[in-house]
């Protein structure tokens, strides 16, 4: 299909940069300031992003590519290609529609950004709470109680007996 | 506005040589493909060489190994080197700016006036 449409299309072999001018003839002519061609055989040049307000210009526009936007401090990237910017918090806060609210007790962040996610919960594991949770930090869990109990020994215990009948391989 | 401006063309003694230049204008020249064409008397127009933007370049069967194709972005010119010219050869050479920066099956956006080329004992 490529070989075909190159063949029938008289466009096909603009550079990227450039598109194919309808107006003169399809020559090629070069991209307008402010816009680029990222491929070959463009019949129209895309308009540059522009990079304004809470979003700063990471890299600028060229003829072949666009220009990539980041977020001004105090905002983080959202989205493909940073297409929004969010506001940051502190760590142990999140974002809601109201601003940035401390992580209730029993989660936490440690990000500027997302959502305040609950504390591990140890015993599920079979652990104990090593280290309480904080707004800002998760739970560390220490070994299991029995773990801990006098008398428990950190031997590893002995393999198992094979069975009758099989001899070593 | 795009011009295409011939020169170099002249009388010439079958197995000489000549060089023919095309000054062009009005258009960015080295983005674009450009090639040479020909038209002997009573006979139509014929392709002869075509060079692209990358300076790949194509020729007619007729005149491999004798013509040469080959261009100078900075003074936006296309040249046709001829050597070992014979009587057949005698033609108006035109240089032709290529649609879409294709020299496989080109085709002219824009022509210039042609300069003649006749090769005579």
């Known amino acids: 299909f490529e070989r075909t449409r190159s063949l029938q299309d008289p466009c096909s072999n603009c550079p990227a940069g450039t598109f194919c001018d309808n107006n003169r003839n399809q020559i090629c002519s070069p991209c307008p300031p402010n816009s680029f061609s990222s491929a070959g055989g463009q019949r129209t040049c895309d308009i540059c992003r522009q990079c304004k307000g809470v979003f700063r210009t990471r890299k600028e526009c060229s003829s072949t590519s666009n220009a990539e936007c980041d977020c001004t401090p105090g905002f983080h990237c959202l989205g493909a290609g940073c297409s929004m910017c969010e506001q940051d918090c502190k760590q142990g806060q999140e974002l809601t529609k109201k601003g940035c609210k401390d992580c209730c007790f029993g989660t936490f962040n440690d990000q500027k950004r997302g959502i305040c996610r609950p504390w591990t919960n140890c015993s599920l594991d079979g652990k104990s709470v090593l280290v309480n949770g904080t707004k800002e930090r998760d739970v560390v869990c220490g070994p299991s109680p029995a773990d801990l109990s006098p008398g428990a020994s950190s031997v590893t215990p002995p393999a198992p007996a094979r069975e009758p009948g099989h001899s070593p391989q | 506005e795009v011009q295409l401006l011939e020169s170099g063309g002249g009388e010439v003694q079958p197995g000489g040589s000549l060089r023919l230049s095309c000054a062009a204008s009005g258009f960015s020249f080295s983005i674009n493909a450009m090639g040479w064409y020909r038209q002997a008397p009573g006979k139509r127009r014929e392709f002869v060489a075509a060079i692209e933007s990358g300076r790949n370049t194509v020729y007619a069967e007729s005149v491999k190994g004798r013509f040469t194709i080959s261009r100078d972005n900075a003074k936006n010119t296309v040249y046709l080197q001829m050597s070992s010219l014979r009587a057949e050869d005698t033609a108006v050479y035109y240089c032709?700016?290529?649609?879409?920066?294709?020299?496989?099956?080109?085709?002219?956006?824009?022509w210039g006036q042609g300069t003649l080329v006749t090769v005579k004992p």
């Open positions: 032709g700016l290529l649609k879409g920066n294709r020299v496989v099956s080109p085709s002219v956006a824009y």
